[in-house]
Interface confidence: medium
Amino acid sequence: DIIMRPSCAPGWFYHKSNCYGYFRKLRNWSDAELECQSYGNGAHLASILSLKEASTIAEYISGYQRSQPIWIGLHDPQKRQQWQWIDGAMYLYRSWSGKSMGGNKHCAEMSSNNNFLTWSSNECNKRQHFLCKYRP
């Protein structure tokens, strides 16, 4: 049998059964999540569940820019350092940078400091680029 690789919407990139869209727009975390959802297909801000997935995403984004952090779908909605993925994925893989998690920082970004391979927490009302993800 011929197994067809699923196709992503135009402009989105495919990796291991998921489609990703990197949006070079400045949005706060909740507006970014709403915009991801608006593209349909069950898209949300991206969950990153393995080092391989993180590396593929980081390589893709580095082709566009290397200086601006990017919102992902990890947040702390209860503000108790109980982080969860907005798409419901299990919070098992972690890639936090060594920075303090304190203050009013309850949303996660891919940090440009380590080529987008590590995460930092940031204030959710900051306006940043964002990464969406869906399963085709």
Epitope: Y22, R24, K25, L26
Partner: antibody, heavy 124, light 110 residues
Framework: EVQLLESGGGLVQPGGSLRLSCAAS????????MSWVRQAPGKGLEWVSA????????YYADSVKGRFTISRDNSKNTLYLQMNSLRAEDTAVYYC?????????????????WGKGTMVTVSS | QTVVIQEPSFSVSPGGTVTLTCGLS?????????PSWYQQTPGQAPRTLIY???TRSSGVPDRFSGSILGNKAALTITGAQADDESDYYC??????????FGGGTKLTVL
């Protein structure tokens, strides 16, 4: 090649009216927002007005609001600026500029191509 | 009324480096203002140099670069040349379809 050519400038008395035109070529005119920017003699640049690609949304600087009207005719690839109740302080070179706004993937918000300008003089 | 502030004039030696800045009368400039920079020589239309803080427009030499320095947008010219002598304007997008130009910086290459 993108080209923007302004016309319609000239000498007008205070309180008078003038309509500027900007003929665009080399790109799909209706796909781009457009703007007018002016420069008084010996002074800096000042943003005046902008209009969406469809013409449905318009924006104005406070200094011209209620006196100037921006419009476009996409079938003629032409941008307009209707200027009423002109004042001496409206004397300037008026530039037409293509405006990069939002796409699905990216926000821009800058002026990427400029015309050579047309001079408007308001004097009695 | 938001005022965008630039140095009125600046001079640089040929081959030298100069950084022009663009600030706000109240508050800090960040990438969320989408700073852009334009070069204008006397009697000519402006030319787009930098947009989205740090992206060079096509055909602009890489000696021109944009950044955020502290609470201002900045345009740095590395290895200044005689024909860089011009007026330089920054523009900030305030949102809701409103753009504000700075007063411009007259750059002299001595």
């Amino acid at each position: 090649e993108v080209q923007l050519l302004e016309s319609g400038g000239g000498l007008v008395q205070p309180g008078g009216s003038l309509r500027l035109s900007c003929a665009a070529s080399g790109f799909t005119f209706s796909s781009y927002a457009m703007s007018w920017v002016r420069q008084a003699p010996g002074k800096g640049l000042e943003w005046v007005s902008a209009i969406s690609g469809s013409g449905g949304t318009t924006y104005y600087a406070d200094s011209v609001k209620g006196r100037f009207t921006i419009s476009r005719d996409n079938s003629k690839n032409t941008l307009y600026l209707q200027m009423n109740s002109l004042r001496a302080e409206d004397t300037a070179v008026y530039y037409c500029a293509r405006l990069r706004g939002s796409t699905r993937w990216e926000d821009f918000y800058y002026f990427d191509y400029w015309g050579k300008g047309t001079m408007v003089t308001v004097s009695s | 009324q938001t005022v965008v502030i630039q140095e009125p004039s600046f001079s640089v030696s040929p081959g030298g480096t100069v950084t022009l800045t663009c600030g706000l009368s109240s508050g800090s400039v960040s990438t969320t203002y989408y700073p852009s920079w334009y070069q204008q020589t006397p009697g000519q239309a402006p030319r787009t140099l930098i947009y989205n803080t740090n992206t060079r427009s096509s055909g602009v030499p890489d000696r021109f670069s944009g950044s955020i320095l502290g609470n201002k947008a900045a345009l740095t010219i590395t290895g200044a040349q005689a024909d860089d002598e011009s007026d330089y304007y920054c523009v900030l997008y305030l949102g809701s379809g409103i753009w504000v130009f700075g007063g411009g910086t007259k750059l002299t290459v001595l």
